[in-house]
């Protein structure tokens, strides 16, 4: 069967919009369908429609198409907002320019080049002709509009109403003449939808024929509408992915506007005395590099040849020999007049200390009002107003809406680990932003670390499974396998979630890992009845510097006599010094004939100050770390134990209070172990479990 062409690229999309007919005489056709693509194909082919389809609305809620013989420019029609609707208008009917010879032109120009009114196509007066609408179906020979049904050289034409002039071409400009851009077109938001060789552009919201990362919802500021040419990545000019499977992308032919001025929104903040950000908007007159060597003129090729000319970088103000940053370097620079020194930075220009350029936060960042809008993994933040429902789901007070503007990184839920944002990516609903605490900010996020202010245990008794107390059971221990070998430990804290260490994932390919649960022997010998082997579906990295990972299992573990979860401590709690705790692991034991059985080492909690003294003052512990020393000299965690838990008991309840991470040596005599303090990250763990989707059992 021949593959039907996807025609949705021929439509202009207006999200959350529908058309309401004021004129009751206007017809509409509706039908249940699955996708907007199906609506588009039917509209383009006019299949089974009693009119020429000019637009359609896809009702996402009812999965329904509404086809129209009119569009938003027609009389007797008005646009209306509607969450569940997307309006698609055939571009041919709303364009006021032509592509190539204008064969597809379906606009409403009806006057010839010399100003004569066109004769209607259905009329034989004053000129008889054979161009009847019935003979040229699909060519839209409507009214007296200019058309080019045969794709002739001169472009759209018509028979004229002047008996002396049989026909004449119409003066409809080429789209490439109408469309123009400033600079390299990063701010271009025009309607050019084909490349310089005439290939039709692929829609930005489609992944066929070419998969790409420029998803409109990920980059709300890039103007990824329909399939129009754009320049999201600093190319020399706008481009698009093409519908040709063999040509991934091509530039578009968009000329530079005669009046090459930029909109206010495109201009980096202009400064003359200091540098804002990377200094792309610096327009001052400093003309030497940091050590006093004079700059070469931008329009000169001596002593250094270059392409950073005023002609090539029209909007970058490359006047005289002033320091500038036309290419997104770290700061303003110039070519130098010293033949031996090609370029130099003008780092003597001071930085503007402007508060809205904040790139650090104080405390936990709940008052951060900077304008960063990207997560630490590079995802563009999604608008706060689209995510209020999700936000209300995990906070129990009304967030300050005045702070939640645009898609800027914020901290509306008092997260201990700084500003964050929603992403619009269903796999990573939210993430932290790459902002650090301001230098010298000592505001603690948890107070009184070494004094038991908050109890770690929830006030409930030990859990019982099938009537058997699990106090001696270690069913929450997980063996993380890398390429079929044990690599690390972990703790099952929820049926689908394992808490472990970041360093346990040398490969980014999740197919390399498995989680073994319910085992006592590292090789699973004798554990066949109780062993559960689960794949890993996602890694969620902890806050910056935490060394933690929450590992999502591909399906939930089945809790039974051999597999159980372990409790988390209360956020910010402290456990009294000398509390007896244990570390568990299948790691290096120092024995040559290691039997592969799960080992336990008994430790006791030590205050951070005393711990630092035991490390001869070389280590300063912070609020995110917890210390425990061995009762037996030289016992403690080592290679293969990383990711595993430090388990303590309070009020007869066992909890994972620490996670074993590398970097503090293996069970060194008289040196207590330093672990990641789980209580410090407890809110983060709960927030992930609450907001990330998990498969149902």
């Amino acid at each position: 069967q021949r593959k039907r062409r996807n025609t949705i690229h021929e439509f202009k999309k207006s999200a959350k919009t529908t058309l309401i007919k004021i004129d009751p005489a206007l017809k509409i056709k509706t039908k249940k369908v699955n996708t907007a693509d199906q609506c588009a194909n039917r509209c383009t082919r006019n299949k089974g429609l009693p009119f020429t389809c000019k637009a359609f609305v896809f009702d996402k809620a009812r999965k329904q198409c509404l086809w129209f013989p009119f569009n938003s420019m027609s009389s007797g029609v008005k646009k209306e907002f509607g969450h569940e609707f997307d309006l698609y208008e055939n571009k041919d009917y709303i364009r006021n320019c032509i592509i190539g010879k204008g064969r597809s032109y379906k606009g409403t120009v009806s006057i010839t080049k010399s100003g004569i009114k066109c004769q209607p196509w259905s009329s034989m007066i004053p000129h008889e002709h054979s161009f009847l609408p019935s003979s040229y179906r699909g060519k839209d020979l409507q009214e007296n509009y200019c058309r080019n049904p045969r794709g002739e050289e001169g472009g759209p034409w018509c028979f004229t109403s002047n008996p002396e002039v049989r026909y004449e071409v119409c003066d409809i400009p080429q789209c490439s003449e109408v469309e123009c851009m400033t600079c390299n077109g990063e701010s271009y938001r025009g309607l050019m939808d084909h490349t310089e060789s005439g290939k039709i552009c692929q829609r930005w919201d489609h992944q066929t024929p070419h998969r790409h990362k420029f998803l409109p919802e990920r980059y709300p500021d890039k103007g990824f509408d329909d399939n129009y040419c754009r320049n999201p990545d600093g190319q020399p000019r706008p481009w698009c992915y093409t519908l040709d499977p063999h040509t991934r992308w091509e530039y578009c032919a968009i000329k530079t506007c005669a009046d090459n001025t930029m909109n206010d929104t495109d201009v980096p903040l202009e400064t003359t005395e200091c540098i804002q950000g990377q200094g792309e908007g610096y327009r001052g007159t400093v003309n030497t590099i940091w050590n006093g060597i004079p700059c070469q003129r931008w329009d000169s090729q001596y002593p250094h040849e270059h392409d950073m000319t005023p002609e090539n970088f029209k909007c970058k103000d490359l006047r005289e020999n002033y320091c500038r940053n036309p290419d997104g370097s770290e700061s303003p620079w110039c070519f130098t007049t010293d033949p031996n020194i090609r370029v130099g930075y003008c780092s003597q220009i001071p930085n503007c200390d402007m508060s809205h350029g904040q790139d650090c936060y104080r405390g936990n960042g709940k008052n951060y009002m900077g304008n960063l809008s990207q997560t630490r993994s590079g995802l563009t933040c999604s608008m706060w107003d689209k995510n209020m429902e999700d936000l209300h789901r995990h906070i129990f007070w009304e967030p300050d809406a005045s702070k939640l503007n645009e898609n800027y990184c914020r901290n509306p839920d008092d997260d201990a680990h700084g500003p964050w944002c929603y992403t619009g990516n269903p796999l990573i609903p939210w993430d932290y932003c790459p902002i650090s605490r301001c230098e010298g900010d000592t505001t603690p996020t948890i107070v009184n670390l070494d004094h038991p202010v908050i109890s770690c245990a929830k006030t409930k008794q030990l859990r019982v499974v099938n009537g058997i107390p699990t106090r001696t059971n270690i069913g929450w221990m997980v063996s993380l396998r890398y390429r079929n070998k044990h690599i690390c430990g972990g703790s099952l804290i929820k049926e689908s979630w394992v808490l472990t260490a970041r360093q346990c994932f040398p490969s980014r390919d999740l197919k390399d890992y498995e989680a073994w649960l319910g085992i006592h022997d590292v090789h699973g010998r004798g554990d066949e009845k109780c062993k559960q082997v689960l794949n890993v579906s996602q890694l969620v990295y902890g806050p910056e510097g935490s060394d933690l990972v929450l590992m999502k299992l591909a399906r939930p573990a089945v809790l039974d006599d051999f597999v159980s979860t372990i409790d988390l401590p209360n956020y910010g709690c402290t456990i009294p010094e000398k509390t007896s705790c244990s570390v568990y692991g299948w790691g290096y034991t120092g024995l040559i004939n290691y039997d592969g059985l799960l080992r336990v080492a008994h430790l006791y909690i030590m205050g951070n100050e005393k711990c630092s003294q035991h490390h001869r003052g070389k280590v300063t512990l912070n609020e995110s770390e917890i210390c425990a020393g061995a009762e037996k000299i030289g016992s403690g965690p080592c290679e293969g134990d990383y990711g595993g838990p430090l388990v303590c008991e309070q009020h007869k309840m066992r909890m994972v209070l620490g996670v074993i991470v590398p970097g503090r040596g293996c069970a060194i005599p008289n040196r207590p172990g330093i672990f990641v303090r789980v209580a410090y990250y407890a809110k983060w763990i709960h927030k992930i479990i609450l907001t990330y989707k998990v498969p149902q059992s």
Partner: antibody, heavy 119, light 110 residues
């Protein structure tokens, strides 16, 4: 100064063994994943082996079973033990620091040591 | 296992030219790709990491792009110092891998 210095290269007969060392200064080898990369005369770069912070290792198929990567934290040194050497193992061997504790790009290289396998 | 294919293997260009080198991964590696420059007798030097991030001290004429399986290293205006061999390297996974590097592209004077 942060640097890596390789040693232990030289001429060895086919089937013979050699141990390369890489002494690190200015940082701790156990805090980073560390790797060996080689380059045969006139050829491209070929990754050989890596040891991660947690002690796990990975090898290129050409090195598996014959080469062993290890480190001595007390000496701040990385090693590559090469057994059953073949003529095709002739190359400059570079020691390289991985940017992270897990697999990633290399942000520090040694100057290289030449290993020649020939009878 | 992941294979890295670089093209072209040799490229002749003149000072001032815009030069583009491509690297293809046999499976998606997201943005986990690095580019290195190597001159004869020297160790490689990191230029770009995570597909598009410029390593410190690297001139801004070098840029990287791409994600998934297709990646590009661009030198906007070739300088005399840029004649060298360039390698891509996947930073995604080395479990069961023959080589993490591409075959290299030698940029020589036209």
């Amino acid at each position: 100064e942060v640097q890596l210095v390789e040693s232990g290269g030289g001429l060895v007969q086919p089937g013979g063994s050699l141990r390369l060392s890489c002494a690190a200064s200015g940082f701790t080898v156990s805090a980073y994943a560390m790797s060996w990369v080689r380059q045969a005369p006139g050829k491209g770069l070929e990754w050989v082996a890596v040891i991660y912070v947690i002690g796990a290792t990975d090898y290129a198929s050409s090195a598996k079973g014959r080469f062993t990567i290890s480190r001595d934290n007390s000496k701040n040194t990385l090693y590559l033990q090469m057994n059953s050497l073949r003529a095709e193992d002739t190359a400059v061997y570079y020691c390289a620091r991985v940017y992270d504790s897990v697999w990633n790009h290399f942000n520090l290289w040694g100057q290289g040591t030449l290993v020649t396998v020939s009878s | 296992d992941i294979q890295m294919t670089q093209s072209p293997s040799t490229l002749s260009a003149s000072v001032g030219d815009r030069v583009t080198i491509t690297c293809q991964a046999s499976q998606s590696i997201s943005s986990w790709l690095a580019w290195y420059q190597q001159k004869p007798g020297k160790a490689p030097k990191l230029l770009i990491y995570q597909a598009s991030k410029l390593a410190s001290g690297v001139p801004s004429r070098f840029s990287g792009s791409g994600s998934g399986t297709e990646f590009t290293l661009t030198i906007s205006s070739l300088q005399p110092d840029d004649f060298a061999t360039y390698y891509c390297q996947q930073a995604y996974s080395v479990s069961n891998v023959d080589n993490a590097f591409g075959g290299g592209t030698k940029v020589e004077i036209k």
